[in-house]
């Protein structure tokens, strides 16, 4: 059986049938005998009963309250009562664009991830036996499937499956022709998979420094979006008053990775700071990486090979 | 991060039954249906299967009507898919997935699990 309508707001466009579906359908079967009633307040209206004398659009059946087709003035609050079962729902009728396939309003967006399995498959139960026939446009041009009852794409997706996607089915009712059309806006964006998470520079630096002066240890990684950056330093971190972690800054890199850098800030050097890992690491599911620097007085410079200084 | 993974697959003489979980993690259960699908070597992904996790609707193909039966447990976020009777053409990575627009309906699947092999041998 077709879903009930759990959700209580919803949104159609004027011109497309529509139906209403309450969540205590079975319970309803069990009861015939029971009063079964369904009203409409809007605006300045409370509570008005529902039935197909209330206008030629509507229809009646067992658990559904149908709309043939539904109009901008069906915009309002709809119930279905039945002993003490009540089920409220929020419509709003939009504006159909008259020149698109599809009225952007009522678009659903959708990421996929380049050569990642996608499917669309264009299928409409509740009016199956109403139905004509089904199209599948892409961008509103119609694709040739040959699948022409339910058209359905499956694929790994690439750059230029990129668009908007359309599923149309045709049908008759009293002799009126309708449409009903749901679409889809598809982005393909690059592999979103996690990196492993890398510190950017060699993993020992020796800083040369002066007593009494103030030095800035910065500290970059290449990592994923819930990696974390931090520093360690010292018996216990924050002991020491004149050592201060900055902000971290994050940058989105082209590819969906952030360049994190983290800054840590010793002012007023002295000879505690000297000689001492000052360490940072970038952790994430996948495993850490550590870098380290060590404050080393200019005076001393002489004792350590050039290539290991940095700035 | 949301994810959907697969188990219960394996080797199983024909006549045989399995039962395939998916459990579901990093979005509302609710708002959700998971659908089954399976795909043999050289030919396309079909879908079996789905289930709406707001009202327990369900639909099957007219392949595995009978066979196949889908069932959840919201509290756990796992769907399953009873096979009975296993036949050597249900040989196949049966995969999960699922979608924000119901079982009944035009429809989008965006979450994949990565697959569970069945082997049917006669």
């Known amino acids: 059986a077709e879903s009930c309508t759990s959700r209580p707001h919803i949104t159609v466009v004027e011109g497309e049938p529509f139906y209403l579906k309450h969540c205590s359908c079975s319970l309803a079967h069990e009861i015939e005998t029971t009063t079964k009633s369904w009203y409409k307040s809007s605006g300045s209206q409370e509570h008005v009963e529902l039935n197909p004398r209330s206008s030629s659009r509507i229809a009646l059946h067992d658990c559904v309250l149908e709309f043939w087709p539904v109009e901008l003035n069906d915009t309002g609050s709809y119930f279905f009562q039945m002993k003490n079962y009540t089920q409220k729902w929020k419509l709003n009728v939009i504006r159909r664009n008259k020149h698109s396939c599809f009225t952007e309003r009522q678009v659903t967006s959708k990421i996929v991830e380049v050569k990642k399995f996608f499917q669309i498959t264009c299928e409409n139960s509740y009016y199956q036996t109403l139905v004509n026939s089904t199209s599948l446009y892409k961008n509103c041009k119609k694709l040739l499937l040959e699948n022409n009852k339910n058209p359905t794409i499956k694929k790994n997706a690439e750059f230029e499956d990129q668009g908007y996607y359309s599923c149309v089915h045709f049908l008759h009712h009293n002799g009126k022709l309708f449409n009903i059309t749901k679409t889809f806006n598809i982005t393909i964006v690059e592999d979103r998979s996690n990196i492993v998470p890398v510190l950017l520079g060699p993993k020992l630096n020796h800083v040369a420094v002066e007593l009494g002066k103030n030095v800035r240890l910065n500290c970059s990684a290449l990592l994923n979006e819930e990696d974390v950056i931090y520093w360690m330093f010292g018996e216990e971190n924050g002991s020491d008053p004149n050592i201060h972690e900055e902000k971290e800054m994050r940058i989105m890199t082209p590819e969906g990775k952030w360049h994190a850098s983290k800054v840590l800030r010793i002012e007023n050097i002295g000879e505690s700071n000297l000689n001492v890992l000052y360490n940072c690491t970038v952790a994430s599911t996948g495993g850490t990486d550590t870098k380290s620097f060590i404050l080393v007085r200019k005076a001393d410079m002489a004792d350590i090979p050039g290539h290991v200084f940095t700035r | 991060e949301v994810q959907l993974v697969e188990s219960g697959g394996g080797l199983v003489q024909a006549g045989g039954s399995l039962r395939l979980s998916c459990a579901a993690s990093?979005?509302?259960?609710?708002?959700?249906?998971i659908g089954w699908f399976r795909q043999a070597p050289g030919k396309e992904r079909e879908e079996v299967s789905c289930i709406s996790s707001s009202d327990g609707s369900t639909r099957y193909a007219d392949s595995v009507k009978g066979r196949f039966t889908i069932s959840s447990d919201n509290a756990k976020n796992t769907v399953y898919l009873q096979i009975d009777s296993l036949k050597p053409e249900d040989t196949a990575v049966y995969y999960c997935?699922?979608?924000?627009?119901?079982?009944?309906?035009?429809?989008?699947?965006?979450?994949w699990g990565q697959g569970t092999q069945v082997t049917v041998s006669s």
């Open positions: 990093g979005f509302t259960f609710d708002d959700y249906a």
């Open positions: 997935a699922s979608t924000s627009e119901g079982c009944h309906d035009d429809r989008f699947y965006d979450y």
